[in-house]
């Protein structure tokens, strides 16, 4: 018996088609993805093959103005239209709190939303009961398939799930649910979840009875053969893990941003064992036409976005200096504003010993593309911020050793004076450079804001200590020559859309007046 699994993950509000790098579509003839194009391909496969499941492994929320404006209603609407069969909760589904998940998505979705390792307690338990499930048994042809969900247990550090949701260890939580499915005579089980490729592989290895793992969170691209676009495969598709009980378990993920549709064919025997598995992600390029009815619906929903772009978010009473003449040479107040917004967006009081889990921000000056003039009645709009941060990136959470940070700051000024983009703007960091010294030895003082303290203060950076840092995904991926970050990072979790972080901060503060205050000397 053959099952076709179609899967997406980490779509991050890419409802419209995008450019090849998943930023805003400029030249339509070369654009990719989007729900209209995805629907065309899904329908084509549904017509051609008998047993098809369409699954999403989480993080539909967060990433473009679509989410900023519609707050998840767009996810429910278009996933319903595409007739998804199931979705796992990702960390970003909690970005607007539990209410921001329940009302727009959980109550509106016509498909099951799953996570076995999230347990509700207190008053929330009854409120959320039945709105998400640990597993769901789906009829497919004359067979049944069990789908069991999981979510990163790091979610409390990455999003805003509140205090009434407990995120358990994935493997510990999954095993009893899979066992329950087995007692219900469900012998074909897919683990669908959002904890990253390493955890996906562990689940495949450790959870007895899981036949296939469909994952997300790490934006992992797997491919067998010659890849069709710019993404470099982390391994073959599917990636085969040998389980502790001697089975071959296929593990898949489909990169991110709706650029690909994962396509996996599984052959099951009478007892539900995987006899064979093969497939590849399908690149959703312009050779696949956009479905006209979905496209028309997108265009209808688009109207509200255009109106939103010009509405006032808040005011500034100072000039926001985002000029390259400032931000690529010295501390600039636009850099300070953005870094302050980045830290504010990551306030998570999850431990009494820590005022916050992260205190530091770094930001390449070259990523700041425009100033904002305060002489327009001080008004700041989304449109203004899109000029400052035009690349559609995210502000991510990484863990780095002190020694890596030191290398990053040396790189920041290794060719100082040439107006290059690698000059770092900071938050929660005091750095002193001596530019008379030779490149690679110019950082003379590097103090960082403590986290394990009740009164935050600056302490010298320790080379062997592991620090959490908020930075643009561009830097996490080694951009602007920061190869040491990419090579040496110990953990990387993707964060919120850059513009959204700053716009939320400005809306919250109402009036802003960032200063140049001696963070960089």
């Amino acid at each position: 018996w053959e099952l076709t699994i179609l899967h997406t993950n980490d779509v991050h509000s890419r409802l419209e088609q995008t450019s090849e790098d998943s930023s805003k579509c400029v030249n339509a003839s070369r654009c990719m993805g989007g729900v209209a194009r995805l629907f065309t391909k899904v329908q084509q496969i549904r017509r051609a093959e008998p047993n098809v499941l369409l699954l999403d492994a989480g993080d539909q929320y967060q990433g473009t103005i679509w989410f900023t404006v519609y707050k998840g209603a767009e996810v429910a609407h278009f996933m319903n239209a595409l007739r998804y069969d199931a979705m796992a909760l990702g960390n970003h589904e909690f970005d607007n709190g539990v209410e921001g998940l329940i009302e727009p998505l959980l109550k509106e979705a016509k498909f099951p939303i799953l996570s076995a390792n999230i347990k509700a307690k207190g008053p929330l338990a009854s409120q959320i009961s039945g709105l998400y499930l640990p597993y769901k048994v789906l009829p497919v042809g004359d067979e049944v398939v069990g789908i069991v969900g999981y979510t990163s247990k790091e979610t409390p550090f990455l999003s805003n799930p509140g205090t009434n949701l407990v995120f358990e260890d994935e493997i510990t939580a999954l095993q009893p649910e899979v066992d329950k499915l087995k007692t219900l005579n469900v012998n074909k089980i897919i683990a669908l979840g959002h904890s990253g490729f390493e955890m996906d592989k562990l689940i495949a290895q450790k959870v007895r009875g899981v036949d296939v793992v469909v994952g997300g969170h790490s934006n992992t691209f797997l491919y067998t053969g010659n890849p069709p676009s710019k993404e470099v495969p982390a391994g073959k598709y599917p990636f085969i893990v040998t389980s502790d009980d001697g089975r071959k378990v296929p593990v898949v993920q489909a990169y991110a941003f709706g650029k690909y549709l994962g396509y996996l064919k599984i052959e099951f025997d009478e007892r539900g064992n995987v006899i064979s598995s093969h497939g590849n992600p399908i690149l959703l390029n312009s050779s696949i036409p956009e479905d006209p009815s979905i496209k028309a619906d997108i265009n209808k929903w688009r109207i509200k976005l255009d109106n939103y772009s010009t509405q006032e978010l808040g005011k500034t009473i100072v000039y926001l200096d985002g000029s390259s003449q400032s931000c690529r040479f010295r501390e600039c107040n636009m850099g300070n504003l953005i870094c302050d917004a980045m830290i504010n967006n990551n306030l998570r009081h999850t431990d009494e010993m820590f005022w916050n889990h992260v205190s530091m921000c770094i930001l390449n000056g070259g990523g700041i593309r425009s100033p904002i003039d305060e002489r327009n009645n001080g008004t700041i709009t989304w449109e203004n911020l899109a000029a400052v941060l035009p690349f559609g990136g995210t502000f991510d959470l990484v863990q780095l050793k002190g020694s890596t940070l030191k290398k990053a700051f040396e790189h920041s000024v290794h060719r100082y004076g040439q107006s290059t983009g690698e000059f770092l703007q900071v938050g929660g960091i005091h750095v002193v450079y001596d530019l008379s010294r030779k490149p690679g030895d110019r950082v003379v003082k590097l103090d960082v804001l403590c986290t394990k303290c009740r009164v935050p203060s600056y302490d010298p950076l320790k080379m062997d200590e592991v620090y959490k840092v908020i930075l643009p995904n561009f830097l996490a991926n080694g951009g602007d020559g920061f190869q040491m970050i990419k090579d040496e990072l110990l953990r990387h979790d993707s964060g919120d859309q850059d513009i959204n972080v700053v716009s939320t901060y400005i809306s919250k503060m109402k009036v802003i007046y960032p200063a140049v205050e001696g963070r960089i000397k």
């Epitope: 004359d142 067979e143 005579n185 025997d269 009478e270 007892r271 064979s276």
Partner: antibody, heavy 113, light 106 residues
Framework: EVTLKESGPVLVKPTETLTLTCTVS????????IQWIRQPPGKLLEWLAV???????DYNAAFISRLTISKDTSKSQVVLTMTNMDPVDTATYYC???????WGQGTLVTVSS | DIQMTQSPSSLSASVGDRVTITCRAS??????LNWLQQKPGKAIKRLIY???SLDSGVPKRFSGSGSGTEYTLTISSLQPEDFATYYC????????FGGGTKVEIK
Amino acid sequence: EVTLKESGPVLVKPTETLTLTCTVSGFSLSSYGIQWIRQPPGKLLEWLAVIWSGGSADYNAAFISRLTISKDTSKSQVVLTMTNMDPVDTATYYCAGQYGSVWGQGTLVTVSS
Amino acid sequence: DIQMTQSPSSLSASVGDRVTITCRASQDIGDRLNWLQQKPGKAIKRLIYATSSLDSGVPKRFSGSGSGTEYTLTISSLQPEDFATYYCLQYAGSWTFGGGTKVEIK
């Protein structure tokens, strides 16, 4: 639980037709095929025929003129008939799932006058 | 038709021994190979499917490997209950079996 059970006569006379039934539980014949295999006493396993989930069949070329396989999906039963039986057809006859994950206990059929 | 050549046809071994049985296919069968165990008066049992995956409840001392036309069943440390006849079965085309290997007590 996934199980298969063969039933049919234990003794048939030469030239007669053998009719064997395989009753399936735990999975659907609309999703999986059924194979028939035999093993003469002290000899090797020999594949006879298969009926696929869609209803089409394949036969061992050596027996194609003598074998017919059919199924009743609603009853979860597969029937194998073998015409013109001969003492050399004395064997244990097995039905098995399409992929061999599950086998019946087998039924010993003796061909003798 | 795909022919399966299994060797040896029989072997004598002691408890604790490592036992290896091989099957050669007349053409590439793309990992579509099972290993079966038959004991007198008992139902035939599949041990390994798709060349190397272990069936539920089968001890880890059994392992399968191979690709293309060459396949191997290994019992890492023979136990008293392992004395039986073993068959390879290809399902890439119409089923064909190897000739069987009878594992006897030395």
